[in-house]
């Protein structure tokens, strides 16, 4: 069963190469236990980048060496995408399915143009 | 190891009301459902819902008709099941039983199981 | 809500010889995620159900492999290969595509 997600156009990764979005979807039912992916599309290729599940009132939890971290709140999802480099820049999808009571759904959005520029090195000072 | 560790059996007359304990160990209990199913004498399984520790959300069996209430105490890790205005239809063993995501959400441990007599 | 419909109601076995229970429900199983829900349970004499099978053919931990699930959307099999004395209880499918969830009304296994 399809549901809307939606999230933003585009974001600019801060120098610092961290990139954050809000992914946000219309739950049909009663969501208890939600599946959030984070997908890479780049050169019409498709990459997992992180996932985490969680159950409604507790935190959004990745695995320990993820490059996310998010919260959530009601039927919103904050992501953070850390250590970002210029050849990250692409479009980051975000899919979202409701895992728990059934029935399932499934929602994947239009994708997030994240855009990241790496700094400039800093002249050497004599 | 996991335990689901019911209260004890219940004799209760019609119209009266019934609340059945659930206590968890052997794991971390807001980080999964816990489902109420009950048998009725020589009968199969009937569904009666799940709660969500963390939040105290429900999902309950329309057939119940708002009877049933579900709680928990997340303090003592402890689910209750209450059912109210009591028939003698609803003479059963009452289960409490842990959902397991990794096993798409099936019933992975059950509690010994409460039995419920309803009797005038 | 789906129904489920097991058969047969009681089946005597000899030990050392397999075992058939079949499960049908009213509405396919079979998700567009390509996922089937539905399980397998057992309840032992006097004991509480136990979980057997999930998501169709899955054998949940500690399961002997003699037992094995199959099945389209709507009718379903649990075979034993050989079945042996600890088998004896009720089976039940249960469905959790949808709320309610909800089980077949058992099958008995007993030993001849």
């Known amino acids: 069963k399809a549901m809307h997600v939606a999230q933003p156009a585009v974001v600019l990764a801060s120098s610092r190469g961290i990139a954050s979005f809000v992914c946000e979807y219309a739950s049909p039912g009663k969501a208890t236990e939600v599946r959030v992916t984070v997908l890479r599309q780049a050169d019409s290729q498709v990459t997992e980048v992180c996932a985490a599940t969680y159950m409604m009132g507790n935190e959004l939890t990745f695995l320990d060496d993820s490059i996310c971290t998010g919260t959530s709140s009601g039927n919103q999802v904050n992501l953070t995408i850390q250590g970002l480099r210029a050849m990250d820049t692409g479009l980051y999808i975000c899919k979202v399915e409701l895992m728990y009571p059934p029935p399932y759904y499934l929602g994947i959005g239009n994708g997030t143009q994240i855009y990241v520029i790496d700094p400039e090195p800093c002249p050497d000072s004599d | 190891q996991v335990q689901l560790v019911q209260s004890g059996a219940e004799v209760k007359k019609p119209g009266a009301s019934v609340k059945v304990s659930c206590k968890a160990s052997?794991?971390?209990?807001?980080?999964?459902?816990i489902n109420w199913v009950r048998q009725a004498p020589g009968q199969g399984l009937e569904w009666m819902g799940d709660?969500?520790?963390?939040?105290?959300?429900?999902n309950s069996n329309q057939k119940f008709e708002g009877r049933v209430t579900m709680t928990r105490d997340t303090s003592i890790s402890t689910a209750y099941m209450e059912l109210s205005r009591l028939r003698s239809d609803d003479t059963a063993v009452y289960y409490c039983?842990?959902?397991?995501?990794?096993?798409?959400?099936?019933?992975?441990?059950w509690g010994q199981g409460t039995l419920v007599t309803v009797s005038s | 809500d789906i129904v489920m419909t097991q058969s047969p109601l009681s089946l005597p076995v000899t030990p050392g010889e397999p075992a058939s229970i079949s499960c049908r429900s009213s509405?396919?199983?079979?998700?567009?995620?390509?996922?089937?829900?539905l399980y397998w349970y057992l309840q032992k004499p006097g004991q509480s159900p136990q979980l057997l099978i999930y998501?169709?053919?899955n054998l949940a931990s500690g399961v002997p492999d003699r037992f094995s699930s199959s099945g389209s959307g709507t009718d379903f099999t649990l075979k034993i290969s050989r079945v042996e004395a600890e088998d004896v209880g009720v089976y039940y499918c249960?469905?959790?595509?949808?709320?309610?969830?909800?089980f077949g009304g058992g099958t008995k296994l007993e030993i001849k």
């Open positions: 709660i969500n520790p963390n939040n105290g959300g429900t």
């Open positions: 249960a469905q959790n595509l949808e709320l309610p969830l909800t």
């Open positions: 039983a842990r959902l397991r995501r990794e096993y798409f959400y099936a019933m992975d441990y």
């Open positions: 509405k396919s199983l079979l998700h567009s995620n390509g996922i089937t829900y």
């Open positions: 052997g794991y971390k209990f807001t980080d999964h459902f």
């Open positions: 998501q169709m053919s």
